[in-house]
């Protein structure tokens, strides 16, 4: 069974998938469609890297631009380095500026919804 066929079989169960499952899926050439991606749990999407999202979505990654103001894409963008977002070639804005250090302070982030940044 190829990645696409596998994805069709599990698509209906993906809404509650944890980050670990999404990371595993990104290695299986599934080309998740954007509608499915938009229904994923925000907390499961946030830890994914730009490279992982690109692999997870395949050609569907081009659709991120139209969804950049909507969750979970909006929140995910805020967590990524701008340099990494730029590699998607879509003009996505709102990432962490180059030279900033991200402190993973779970309590701070839970309260504010955004990562804590230290300037250069």
């Amino acid at each position: 069974m190829n990645g696409s066929e596998y994805f069709v079989k599990i698509q209906s169960f993906l809404g509650g998938a944890p980050t670990e499952d999404l990371k595993a899926l990104s290695q299986q050439n599934v080309s998740m469609d954007l509608a499915t991606f938009m229904k994923l749990r925000t907390d499961a999407v946030l830890p994914l890297t730009v490279a992982e999202v690109q692999k997870l979505l395949g050609p569907h990654v081009e659709g991120l631009k139209a969804e950049e103001r909507h969750r979970p894409v909006r929140d995910w963008i805020l967590r990524q380095r701008q340099d990494d977002l730029d590699t998607l070639g879509l003009g996505l804005q709102g990432g962490i500026p180059n030279g900033y250090l991200v402190l993973d302070l779970s309590m701070q982030e839970a309260l504010s919804g955004t990562p804590c940044l230290l300037g250069p």
Epitope: P59, E62, G63, K65, A66, D86, T87, G89, L90, G91
Partner: antibody, heavy 121, light 107 residues
């Protein structure tokens, strides 16, 4: 203003390869993927594939996977499509097109004038 | 892939008249359809996107409609410069597909 410049014509012999160009200007080249479209004489439009100009990653219509190779040169804001093992079936007008990402995956709002490729001995 | 079936393949109408072209998608495309005018020696010209949204500078004689799998495109008050081939494009999927085209002639 946005412009996509393509050479007018290319004449190539059967079995050879050709590299078509599309020079972009008037916008940030790395903020929009570039798409390629084929039109055979008297036929409709057919999507060939696209390329992310920032990291050079292409995606292809399965029909063209072994025929076309998409690349970019960021320094000159130019996209290229190489067509290999040319036959008369490849004689067509080839367009580059830029999408506008207002909704979903984006529709094409800017097009090149097209390059007419003739494959003939 | 999503197939787009466009009809008719050609049509002839009188100046000042009205024509309608249809495109049927092989699956629901959620109104993500655009319409283009194509003249020889030029790149296609975008007329309408998202089913019915007119591009800036395009006359209101051009209109679009539809939902789900069925879409239509109309030109009223036909003018000589409307002679062209018209195409629909679906962009609900990253692998874009066009309709087969409709060649419009004036009687």
């Amino acid at each position: 203003q946005v412009q996509l410049q393509q050479p007018g014509t290319e004449l190539v012999k059967p079995g050879a390869s050709v590299k078509l160009s599309c020079k972009a200007s008037g916008y940030t080249f790395t903020n929009y993927w570039m798409h390629w479209v084929k039109q055979r004489p008297g036929q409709g439009l057919e999507w060939i594939g696209n390329i992310n100009p920032s990291n050079g990653g292409p995606y292809y219509n399965e029909r063209f996977r072994s025929k076309a190779t998409l690349t970019v040169d960021k320094s000159s804001s130019t996209a290229y499509m190489q067509l290999s093992s040319l036959t008369s079936e490849d004689s067509a007008v080839y367009y580059c097109a830029r999408p506008y990402y207002g909704s979903s995956y984006g529709y094409f709002d800017y097009w090149g004038q097209g390059t007419t490729l003739t494959v003939s001995s | 892939d999503i197939q787009m079936t466009q009809s008719p393949s050609s049509l002839s109408a009188s100046l000042g008249g009205k024509v309608t072209i249809t495109c049927k998608a092989s699956q629901d495309i959620n109104k993500y359809i655009a319409w283009y005018q194509h003249k020889p020696g030029k790149g296609p010209r975008l007329l309408i996107h998202y089913t019915s949204e007119l591009q800036p500078g395009i006359p209101s004689r051009f209109s679009g409609n539809g939902s789900g799998r069925d879409y239509s495109f109309s030109i009223s008050n036909l003018e000589p410069e409307d002679i062209a081939t018209y195409y629909c494009l679906q962009y609900a999927n990253p692998l874009r597909t066009f309709g087969g085209g409709t060649k419009l002639e004036i009687k």
